[in-house]
Amino acid sequence: QSFQVNPPESEVAVAMGTSLQITCSMSCDEGVARVHWRGLDTSLGSVQTLPGSSILSVRGMLSDTGTPVCVGSCGSRSFQHSVKILVYAFPDQLVVSPEFLVPGQDQVVSCTAHNIWPADPNSLSFALLLGEQRLEGAQALEPEQEEEIQEAEGTPLFRMTQRWRLPSLGTPAPPALHCQVTMQLPKLVLTHRKEIPVLQSQTSPKPPNTTSAEPYILTSSSTAEAVSTGLNITTLPSAPPYPKLSPRTLSSEGPCRPKIHQDLEAGWELLCEASCGPGVTVRWTLAPGDLATYHKREAGAQAWLSVLPPGPMVEGWFQCRQDPGGEVTNLYVPGQVTPNSSS
C-alpha cells in the first residue's frame, strides 16, 4: 500500500482569495482503498471523493483556517495525515508617515500595514532600514493594532502600526529610509517595503544642537569601517568596544568607500584613504567653515587635512570623496574634545 498527500507539508499557508487543492490518495493491493477527510468545519472547503482518493478544495477565506485530517484505509490497515491550513492576508498596503523626513529634527516615523491576518506580533515584524541594514539608534515605540472597517461581514482584518523615534539624520542625509514589514508563516516568509524619502537640504550642513560632545549621527552596519590611530572612530555598532567619545562616519551606499583616519598625535590631522584598487583618487570636499582655510595634501589614494595654524580640529562635518565612483565618507567631529594620548 502507498498513502500520499499532495502537497505533502503538514502546514500550508494560503493567501486570502486564492484556492488550494490538497489531494489525498491511497493504493490498495486488495480492493479499493477508502479515503476521506475528517475534522472538517462545515465551512472549510469542499471535498470531492473518488475511488482511492479525496480532494479537499480550500477557497482561501479566513474561515478556511483549520486542521483537516485525511484518513486512508485498506483492509485492516489505516493511515492518517493532518494538514494545518492557515489562510493569511498580507497585501502590499504599507502607509508611512511623515511622507518625507527632515534632517536635523527629532521626529517620529510610523509605518502601518493594512488588511493583515493573522494579526499576531509573532508573525508580523517591522524594521526600519538604512540601505539593507536595520537602522541603529532608532527607538521603537509601542506597536498598535486596530481592526479595519469592513464593508462585508466576516473574519475581520487588522492594521498594525509601528512607530520609531529617529536619531538625527545628519548631513548629508541618506536619500531615504525604508519601512520593511515581514510576515513569517510556516515555510513562507513574505516582505513588503516602503520608502520614506529624506528631504535633501540645499543649505550648509548643520547638526542639531547638542549639549555635549556626543556622536549622534545614525549609522548602519553596512557603512564602511573607519579605523583610527588616535581617537577611535567606528561605524560598526555591533562591534564593541566603543570609545567614550567617538565621532562616527556615515558612508554613502557603494561597493567600496574611502576610510577616514584621525590622528591625534599629529595635532588633529585627518587622513582619507582609498584601497579600492589602482587609479582611485580621494579628495576632501567638505569641512566646517571654508575648506580653503585648511592645509590639504593630496596624493592619489591618500589625502590629508589639518588645521592651520596647528590646533584643535573644528567641530562639524568632514567629507572625503573618492573618484571614480563618487562614493563619500562623512565624519562628524564633536566639539570640546581635547587630544588625549590615552584615548
Epitope: 521603537a140 515605540l141 536619531p167 555591533s238 566603543y242
Partner: antibody, heavy 119, light 107 residues
C-alpha cells in the same frame, strides 16, 4: 542649571486621585520628551509614562494604563501626572526625568515626590 | 517586554577594589543601554549611556561595555562615594525597562 522639581505627592485613600507636577528649568522644555518613573519602597525603578515634546505622543505602562494621564504645559515649563483610582501598589516615590533627544536615555532626574496610598 | 536581569543582586567590596556588575537583556537591545547610580533617598544619576559612553562629569573609573544582550559596568577602583545601588536600563523599545538593581556595600 538644568533642574526638575516634583511636587503634589502625599497621602491618599485607595480609589482617590492625586495630581503630580514637575517644574522644569534651565533648558528649552518643549524640545524634550519627558517621563515619569516610580520606585516602590525597597524596590527597583519602574517606568510608567512618557510624553513627547509637543504632547502629541503619550504612552503608559500596563500597570497604570487607563488610570494615569500624563500631560504638559510648555508655556509653564511643567509636566503633570494625573493619577486616578489609586491603589495601595501605587505607593512609591515618583520621579520625573528628561529624555535626551536622538539618544533616548534619561539624562536628568528630579528629586522625587512621595505618594502613599493607604486607608 | 524586554526583561533586564542584573547580577549579582548585591555585593560587598572594599575601597580600591575592582567591581563588575553584569546586565542581561532577554532580547537584543543593540547598544541602547544606560547605567544609573542611586544612593538612599536620592534620585538616580546617569553614569553611562549607549552601553559605553561616559556621561559628562562622571569619574573615569566608571566604564561600560557590551552590545546586544550582555553588558557590564565596571568600577576600576571603588571609592567611598561609590557605595550605592546600580541599575541598568534598556531604551531600545517601549516599555523601557530597568534591571532589578545591584547593591554595592562596604565589606
Amino acid at each position: 542649571e538644568v533642574q526638575l522639581l516634583e511636587s503634589g505627592g502625599g497621602l491618599v485613600q485607595p480609589g482617590g486621585s492625586l495630581r503630580l507636577s514637575c517644574a522644569a528649568s534651565g533648558f528649552t522644555f518643549s524640545d524634550f520628551w519627558m517621563h515619569w518613573v516610580r520606585q516602590a519602597p525597597g524596590k527597583g525603578l519602574e517606568w510608567i509614562s512618557y510624553i513627547s515634546g509637543d504632547g502629541g505622543y503619550t504612552n503608559y505602562a500596563d500597570s497604570v494604563k487607563g488610570r494615569f494621564t500624563i500631560s504638559r504645559d510648555n508655556s509653564k515649563n511643567t509636566l503633570y501626572l494625573q493619577m486616578n483610582s489609586l491603589r495601595a501598589e501605587d505607593t512609591a516615590v515618583y520621579y520625573c526625568a528628561r529624555d535626551r533627544p536622538y539618544y533616548y536615555y534619561m539624562d536628568v532626574w528630579g528629586k522625587g515626590t512621595t505618594v502613599t496610598v493607604s486607608s | 517586554d524586554i526583561q533586564m536581569t542584573q547580577s549579582p543582586s548585591s555585593l560587598s567590596a572594599s575601597v580600591g577594589d575592582r567591581v563588575t556588575i553584569t546586565c542581561r537583556a532577554s532580547q537584543s537591545v543593540s547598544r541602547s543601554l544606560a547605567w544609573y547610580q542611586q544612593k538612599p533617598g536620592k534620585a538616580p544619576k546617569l553614569l553611562i549611556y549607549a552601553a559605553s559612553s561616559l556621561q559628562s562629569g562622571v569619574p573615569s573609573r566608571f566604564s561600560g561595555s557590551g552590545s546586544g544582550t550582555d553588558f557590564t559596568l565596571t568600577i576600576s577602583s571603588l571609592q567611598p562615594e561609590d557605595f550605592a545601588t546600580y541599575y541598568c536600563q534598556q531604551y531600545k523599545s517601549y516599555p523601557v525597562t530597568f534591571g532589578q538593581g545591584t547593591k554595592v556595600e562596604i565589606k
